[in-house]
């Protein structure tokens, strides 16, 4: 006990009343107003509790403190007076803070700040939405993946920031009257081939596909080494050049030089160069046959092989090249007598006649084109007088039936053997290479050297043998009529042709032989 009458055992947060009693300090309370035993305690009064008489007023919050309390403005509000705390409603000067004005970038990009009492909200621009994890951040709505399918099936959806577009797919274009971009866009396939929007090389033909196109090698062309066919970047080369090379086993410098020229012409060949290339090949052939050089020293059989190879290859090359010519009639002649006549037309329904110095050919146009071939129709005739040098002493092989009949009615071939070539060798070709069985025959009128009396004149063609060489044959060809210096032949196939004079000892005009030939 304190001698002055104040209890020394008062609990924390209390003061003594007298020597035997204590009272809790303001802001604290105990079970009874007067504390008489040291076991009692003073507890903080929560002035902010609901039943409290304290009222801070609107836009404010009550904050309890040890033994007291403070009124403060709620978040988003601030006191006009500037005082951070106050004790009652009468001192309250809280008013709303305009956060949007205070910090214009509060809503970051793509959002508009909207002030609210005590706070603000972010309103996203069209095409944006609030990010769930950060409700103040607007992010782009991907309309293309949101399952809304906002675009027509002929278009593809392109998401962009805050928006989207419905764009025509590559190789498609808006249908007439349709925009290209808005959600009402409707597209259709572009025909790049007919519209000229393709990038096909001139060695290829353009084929339209849905939404795209491809480039295929022209007929008679093949993809360049290592480049696939039917691609946008396909580049092709003319097969005729790559396959026309010297025959195996023949060693001739003159012939090698000829084929070097052919390969040179093929190396940088383009369809537009067809006319010049044809002329250059025939010029080279004309020179080769005018001056055969070491070809003349080859054994006869090898010479026949070379001739066979030249005739066969020339026909293929001319057929391939002439498909790239424009419509019309072409005639070329060369110093040693080589002559080319060519007619190129879109399919026409009439007969065609090609006239040359020593030969005339007549046939039906509709033979020229293979059905389904989109190219032009070509009919060609080449006279190659120089080929006679290489075909000297070439054998004539008759069909067994003709051979038998001749043996029965004649003494057969005289001892001096091989038939004599009376005419120029001519080669006929069409754009259609299937000419083994023509639906209507072709007629040739040959001008030639005089026929020796009592000799038989035969219309023949060169048959390329299995061994790559060949021989004269008469199958499918008949002699319609012959005069001293001209003969008319009719054949049911195309190849290389000539008129031969066979050394038969013909006593008089034989009706059987006439029928046979």
């Amino acid at each position: 006990q304190d001698s002055r009458g104040c209890a020394r055992w008062c609990p924390q947060d209390s003061s003594c009343v007298n020597a035997t009693a204590c009272r809790c300090n303001p802001g604290f309370s105990s079970f009874s107003e007067i504390i008489t035993t040291p076991m009692e305690t003073c507890d903080d009064i929560n002035e902010c509790a609901t039943l409290s008489k304290v009222s801070c007023g609107k836009f404010s919050d009550c904050w309890n403190t040890e033994g007291s309390y403070d009124c403060v403005c709620s978040p988003g509000y601030e006191p006009v007076s500037g005082a951070k705390t106050f004790k009652n409603e009468s001192e309250n000067t809280c008013q709303d803070v305009d956060e949007c004005q205070q910090n214009p970038r509060l809503c970051k990009s793509y959002g508009t700040c909207v002030n609210t009492l005590g706070s603000y909200t972010c309103q996203c621009l069209p095409g944006f939405k609030l990010k769930p994890e950060d409700p103040k951040l607007c992010t782009d709505v991907n309309e293309c993946t949101s399952g809304q399918n906002p675009c027509h099936s002929s278009t593809h959806c392109l998401n962009n920031v805050g928006s989207y577009q419905c764009r025509c797919r590559p190789g498609w274009q808006p249908i007439p009257g349709s925009p290209n971009g808005p959600n009402n866009t409707v597209c259709e396939d572009v025909d790049e081939c007919s519209s000229g929007q393709h990038q096909c090389d001139s060695s290829t033909v353009c084929f339209n596909t849905v939404g795209s196109y491809s480039c295929r090698c022209r007929p008679g062309w093949k993809p360049r080494h290592g480049i696939p066919n039917n691609q946008k970047d396909t580049v092709c080369e003319d097969m005729t050049f790559s396959t026309w090379t010297p025959p195996p086993g023949v060693h001739s410098q003159t012939l090698s030089r000829f084929f070097d020229k052919v390969q040179d012409l093929g190396r940088d060949y383009k369809p537009g160069l067809a006319n010049n290339t044809i002329q250059s090949i025939l010029q080279a052939l004309d020179e080769l046959l005018e001056a055969p050089g070491d070809l003349e020293t080859l054994p006869r059989l090898q010479q026949h092989c070379v001739a066979s190879h030249l005739l066969d290859g020339l026909e293929d090359v001319l057929r391939g090249l002439s498909k790239n010519l424009s419509n019309g009639l072409l005639n070329f002649s060369y110093p040693a007598g080589t002559e080319l006549s060519l007619e190129v037309q879109k399919q026409v329904d009439r007969s065609v006649t090609l006239r040359q110095n020593q030969a005339v050919m007549q046939l039906d146009w509709n033979q020229a084109q293979k059905s389904g071939d989109p190219g032009p129709s070509v009919v060609g005739l080449v006279s190659i007088p120089g080929m006679g040098k290489l075909l000297a002493e070439a054998p004539l092989v008759l069909e067994p039936e003709k051979q038998m009949l001749l043996h029965e009615t004649h003494q057969g071939l005289l001892q001096d053997g091989s038939p004599i070539l009376l005419s120029d060798v001519i080669s006929a070709f069409l754009s259609n290479n299937d000419t083994q069985n023509l639906s209507s025959p072709v007629t040739f009128t040959f001008s030639h050297r005089s026929v020796i009396p009592r000799q038989k004149v035969l219309c023949v063609f060169w048959e390329h043998g299995q061994n790559g060489c060949g021989h004269w044959a008469t199958t499918g060809c008949s002699t319609i009529g012959t005069r001293d210096t001209s003969t008319i032949c009719r054949c049911t196939h195309l190849s290389s042709f000539a008129v031969l004079m066979a050394h038969y000892d013909v006593q008089e005009e034989d009706p059987v032989l006439t029928v046979i030939t």
Epitope: S203, D264, R267, D268, K270, L273, N276, S280
Partner: antibody
């Protein structure tokens, strides 16, 4: 008759580019390659390359790859050569010529003089 | 690339004289062409495909050869023939020219 008319003389600074033209007339533009040839002062003829006007295909000598760009415009029958990153060694007369393997270069333009000087 | 070597590089001749120049190729060539160029002028095609005279070229000019060796001949020099002559091939890419033979008046 066949004619190849080239653009006028050019003076350019080092590093710049020039685009020369060659207008063809009197023949079918797509029936021949268009050749470009350089002749430096007092020197011989040097092939740069060729363009085929029918499809824009080009051939170049290695030395001029990336240096000379060859193009052709079928609609105007004009061939072009752009020479880039010019240096003093590019000072020369540049010719265009119509060419075909078997015939050589049968018609030539009058030439365009390019002078590279700082 | 095929290198074309022309010889001689320069030669002198008098009018009426026969002149021969050669062009040697590092590999076989099948199409050889020759051009004439006078000072300040564009080249002119003179002989093509080894031996064919270009339009307007006088018959005193001739060409021959095959493989790697080619010859250009003027049977009887005329004053207007003094010029530089170039050979050229396109048998393989790149196309190449010879260095030229300059024909001067003696």
């Amino acid at each position: 008759q066949v004619q190849l008319v080239q653009s006028g003389a050019e003076v350019a600074k080092p590093g710049a580019s020039v685009k020369l033209s060659c207008k063809a007339s009197g023949y079918t533009f797509t029936n021949y390659w268009m050749q470009w040839i350089k002749q430096a002062p007092g020197q011989g003829l040097e092939w740069i390359g060729a363009v085929y006007p029918g499809d824009g295909d080009t051939r170049h000598t290695q030395k001029f790859k990336g240096k000379a760009t060859l193009t052709a415009d079928k609609s105007t029958s004009t061939a072009y050569m752009e020479v880039s990153s010019l240096r003093s060694e590019d000072t020369a007369v540049y010719y265009c010529a119509r060419g075909f393997t078997a015939y050589g270069m049968d018609y030539w333009g009058q030439g365009t003089t390019v002078t590279v000087s700082s | 690339e095929i290198v074309l070597t022309q010889s001689p590089a320069t030669m002198s001749a008098s009018p009426g004289e026969r002149v021969t120049m050669s062009c040697s190729a590092s590999s076989s060539v099948s199409y050889m062409h020759w051009y004439q160029q006078k000072s300040g002028q564009s080249p002119k095609r003179w002989i093509y495909d080894t031996s064919k005279l270009a339009s307007g070229v006088p018959a005193r000019f001739s060409g021959s050869g095959s493989g790697t060796d080619y010859t250009f001949t003027i049977s009887s020099m005329e004053p207007e023939d003094f010029a530089t002559y170039y050979c050229q091939q396109w048998s393989s890419n790149p196309l190449t020219f010879g260095g030229g033979t300059k024909l001067e008046i003696k």
